[in-house]
């Protein structure tokens, strides 16, 4: 059968019909509807929104829409005992206190249930002590402090600026350095773009604005009390002392007005270099402690938040496939927000809503996709990707056998400059081909393709005439699908022209000022960038669900595997003597990559030539494509990170947001010169090369002719 017959398609029911049905005005209306009150995970408001979305998806025409609930560990401030930080004098009197909440944005003064800024999952505590400024609290910042400057953070409260890396990594690093508390703040250098007004007059962060966020180090575990298994009605829960990833020291976030008051008194060592200075009018002294006049003053944290097992709700919608109903293409994004969620997540949820509506319209006209499409509105993403992870844990057997692809749909915008895509190499060609067919929304690119504006504004560092596509890291709901289950995944959004500030987010990220008005006034008044993102995300889902042959190109994996092998080899070659001493060879890895390249090339040739009218052969070839990503999964996982099982990619051990290639080898090599037992350390490098080489070779063999 042809594609049209197979999916009961009429000539007008094609990708164009689906894309033409997507409307910017609808996305705008949906965004407004989703952002009028807070939708914090675990609250009644977010449950009501789940039921509203369930009802609307049913109206839009999905075959079924169900709520999937779980009881997971969440964290909330104490309503009667607020969190704050103070400067205390020698008598213990509080001479300065940080703000208890953010000044509300215009029009929202009377909204109740705005959660004040807090670091989710911080333990309770009231530590007091001297302050040490630790820059971004990255691994390299603590190396600089401890090794070069000989500054000991043990028993100190550290203050770190947000940005560059995931906040959970900052807290982990501070804990390892012996700190007894962490203060996180937003420096204007990272969250105030020059020449732009602060909200409500522009998209910059006001001095009283604060970034919320969780500070877990879950490493893909999901609910901290039920790692590996769903947090259902009969779940066995760990005790809090055995919970995964919880921080052990109090943590609290503040804005730059309050940070100014803490940092202006800092004494001790001067900053080591200009990269440690932000934009506040303070010396950025490292400490420890305050300068002479204020040396008897200390900093005291007052943290009273509580961890509570709370019910969360995912919304799961199904559009059954006509030909291969047992093959799932998943489009998912979260629904829960820290406050109003103007960008994160509702700019993404509004796009998903419009994609569902468009698919529903086609279905009502008699069309079905070839494969089943699952739509998900995840809960509790902000508390550690909990909703998506619990659902995937509950459905892991189905997903590992039937999961074709997962497309993530969190924030549609983090700027309005150009497209940003992170995905598996299997999707490179799909993304390239799709963006060549879409119109660019960018000024100066009228009548040009999205591919052209994207390539011009964000060129690939390796291949001229092609756009940059990044590795998948984590910090979003694709994590469990890609890093744990090995389902081909991708994400797309519009981003800023701020390559140097890649992981700091937009200025109002996770603050009370992330409102509908922020988007409508400053980022995307015509909602044209939202529409483009809807076309990219929706177009990817359409192709993945409807193309006869899956739109995966295994040759692109071969190309990146060679690049990653070269990169990790060059890192190792910084230690030529040790490689010789311990007989470290990358020959097996390069050999496996060479084999993969040859087998992928032959597979691609067969893919061009086979009889697509033979459903058995078609299914066989598609299964080889679908299971290729799965073949990179090591069932034993990475060292000390059992839920990160992808051998080619994992979130960086130093920054959850960033992706690392050959992470097992990378981590074994990291800081190897400081290891107390070099023989053991280089032995682990060799073991990781072995695991990587074996996995690449095994993956290659899944593409060989089956008999």
């Amino acid at each position: 059968k042809s594609s049209n017959e197979a999916t009961n398609i009429t000539p007008k029911h094609n990708m164009k019909a689906f894309l033409d049905e997507l409307k910017a005005e609808n996305i705008k209306k949906f965004l407004y509807n989703f952002t009028q009150i807070p939708h914090l995970a675990g609250t009644e408001q977010n449950f009501q929104l789940a039921k509203q979305i369930q009802s609307q998806w049913k109206e839009f025409g999905l075959d079924s829409v169900e709520l999937a609930h779980y009881d997971v560990l969440l964290s909330y401030p104490n309503k009667t005992h607020p969190n704050y930080i103070s400067i205390i004098n020698e008598d213990g009197n509080e001479i300065f206190n940080t703000s208890l909440f953010e000044p509300p944005p215009p029009g929202y003064e009377n909204v109740s249930d705005i959660v004040p800024p807090f670091s989710a999952f911080s333990p309770q505590g009231m530590p007091e002590g001297d302050l040490v400024y630790v820059n971004y609290a990255r691994t390299e910042d603590f190396f600089k402090l401890e090794r070069d400057m000989k500054i000991n953070c043990s028993g100190k409260i550290v203050i770190a600026r947000y940005g560059k890396v995931f906040r959970g990594n900052k807290v982990k690093n501070a804990q390892l350095a012996g700190a007894k508390g962490v203060i996180l703040y937003s420096d204007p250098a990272d969250y105030f773009a020059p020449g732009v007004k602060s909200y409500p007059d522009g998209w910059n962060l006001p001095g009283g604005g604060v970034q919320r966020g969780n500070i877990l180090n879950l490493n893909g575990a999901g609910d901290p009390l039920t790692p590996g298994y769903p947090a259902n009605e009969y779940a066995y829960r760990r005790g809090i002392a055995e919970a995964v990833g919880l921080p052990s020291i109090p943590v609290h976030p503040i804005g730059y007005y309050d940070a100014q008051k803490l940092l202006e008194k800092m004494g001790g060592s001067a900053p080591p270099d200009s990269s440690w200075r932000g934009s506040l009018k303070v010396p950025y002294n490292v400490g420890p402690g305050f300068t002479g006049n204020f040396s008897t003053q200390k900093v005291k944290m007052h943290i009273h938040s509580t961890n509570e097992v709370t019910r969360i709700y995912n919304v799961i919608g199904t559009l059954r496939g006509a030909v291969e109903p047992d093959r799932y293409v998943i489009l998912g994004g979260h629904r829960d927000s820290w406050v109003f969620g103007g960008i994160d997540p509702q700019s993404g949820a509004a796009v998903v809503h419009e994609i569902v509506r468009s698919f529903g319209t086609l279905k009502k006209e008699g069309w079905r996709p070839r494969r089943t499409i699952l739509f998900a509105s995840w809960d509790a993403e902000e508390f550690g990707l909990l909703g998506s992870t619990e659902w995937a844990e509950e459905n892991s057997r189905l997903l590992q056998e039937r999961g074709v692809a997962y497309i993530n749909a969190d924030s549609s915008i983090e700027g309005n400059y150009t497209l940003r895509v992170d995905c598996t190499p299997l999707m490179y060609s799909l993304v390239h081909n799709l963006t060549k067919e879409l119109k660019s929304p960018d000024e100066g690119f009228e009548g040009k393709s999205l591919y052209e504006s994207w390539t011009k504004k964000s060129p690939s560092p390796e291949f001229s005439g092609m756009p940059r596509i990044s590795k998948l890291g984590s910090g979003n709901d694709f994590e469990v699908f890609f890093q744990r289950l090995g389902i081909a995944s991708g994400r797309a959004r519009y981003t800023k022209n701020w390559e140097t500030n890649k992981f700091s987010g937009y200025p109002l990220y996770h603050s009370v000022y992330e409102t509908y008005e922020l988007v409508e006034k400053f980022y995307d008044p015509m909602f044209k960038y939202h529409l483009t993102v809807a076309q990219v995300r929706g177009g990817m889902v359409f192709e993945l669900a409807n193309s006869i042959v899956l739109p995966f190109d295994c040759r692109d994996y071969a190309v990146v595997l060679r690049k990653y092998a070269d990169k990790i080899y060059s890192i190792s070659m910084k230690h030529p003597q040790e490689m010789k001493t311990y007989s470290v060879s990358f020959d097996s890895l390069f050999s496996a990559v060479k084999n993969f390249t040859e087998i992928a090339s032959k597979f691609s040739e067969r893919l061009q030539d086979f009889d697509k009218s033979n459903p058995i052969v078609l299914r066989m070839m598609n299964d080889q494509l679908m299971f290729l990503e799965r073949a990179f999964i090591d069932p034993l996982g990475l060292p000390d990170r059992p839920f990160y099982r992808h051998v080619i990619y994992a979130p960086s051990s130093h920054n959850k947001y960033a992706g690392e290639s050959f992470p097992g080898i990378y981590d074994a090599l990291f800081d190897i010169e400081s290891k107390v037992d070099p023989s053991k350390a280089w032995g682990e490098v060799k073991r990781q090369i072995y695991v990587a080489a074996f996995t690449v070779q095994a993956a290659a063999e899944t593409l060989s002719e089956v008999a």
């Epitope: 001479i95 300065f96 206190n97 940080t98 703000s99 208890l100 909440f101 953010e102 000044p103 509300p104 215009p106 003064e109 007004k197 602060s198 909200y199 409500p200 007059d201 006001p206 001095g207 009283g208 007005y257 008051k261």
Partner: antibody, heavy 119, light 107 residues
Framework: EIQLQQSGPELVKPGASVKMSCKAS????????MHWVKQNNGESLEWIGY????????RYNQNFNGKATLTVDKSSSTAYMQLNSLTSEDSAFYYC????????????WGQGTSVTVSS | DVQITQSPSYLAASPGETITINCRAS??????LAWYQEKPGKANKLLIH???TLQSGIPSRFSGSGSGTDFTLTISSLEPEDFAMYYC?????????FGGGTKLEIK
């Protein structure tokens, strides 16, 4: 030196209107909000509203909706407040004051304009 | 609207003394309270904002403290030029509102 120079005292009849001015100098006029505050003789202060010259947004205290109208002339860095349908209740001192942003306190004030409503 | 209650409304003290003026908000205003000084024939002066931040150029004998609903202005070692009218004002939520004022006179 930053200054907010307000216009002179006004004696007006009930039912009439009055328009007072506040000329700013020593800073970039469009970078700061301009607020207006009422003070009844020897009594406390009441915030009337603001004009933001950066984007021409205004916000009023509901108590002054329809009573006060705030405008600016950016070319002369001057803010204006018009009060209409005047009654004896409107007899007061009126101050202009600037703030750096929406959430910031008023760091510089004018010397005030006296308005007396009397027949 | 946020109501601000200021006390006392009248205070007599001598130069060199330390005095305190209190303001209470009808609901939590975090730390967003400002203090102003008013003198006849002079423009009002911002002394303190955000509860405890001293405005540049203001002598350090002025200090502010408090958070939530209760705030205090302290003037230590009163100088002759400090005898004036003082107002507090919340600057977190529009419409901005003021306390009733405190008249500080020489004893």
């Amino acid at each position: 030196e930053i200054q907010l120079q307000q216009s002179g005292p006004e004696l007006v009849k009930p039912g009439a209107s009055v328009k007072m001015s506040c000329k700013a100098s020593g800073y970039t006029f469009t970078d700061y909000y301009m607020h207006w505050v009422k003070q009844n003789n020897g009594e406390s202060l009441e915030w009337i509203g603001y004009f933001n010259p950066y984007n021409d947004y205004t916000r009023y205290n509901q108590n002054f909706n329809g009573k006060a109208t705030l405008t600016v002339d950016k070319s002369s860095s001057t803010a204006y407040m018009q009060l209409n349908s005047l009654t004896s209740e409107d007899s007061a001192f009126y101050y202009c004051a600037r703030s750096d942003g929406y959430y910031d306190a008023m760091d510089y004030w004018g010397q005030g304009t006296s308005v007396t409503v009397s027949s | 609207d946020v109501q601000i209650t200021q006390s006392p409304s009248y205070l007599a003290a001598s130069p060199g003394e330390t005095i305190t003026i209190n303001c209470r908000a009808s609901k939590s205003i975090s730390k967003y309270l400002a203090w102003y000084q008013e003198k006849p024939g002079k423009a009002n002066k911002l002394l303190i904002h955000s509860g405890s931040t001293l405005q540049s150029g203001i002598p350090s004998r002025f200090s502010g403290s408090g958070s939530g609903t209760d705030f205090t202005l302290t003037i230590s070692s009163l100088e002759p030029e400090d005898f004036a009218m003082y107002y507090c004002q919340q600057h977190i939520e529009y419409p901005w509102t003021f306390g009733g004022g405190t008249k500080l006179e020489i004893k």
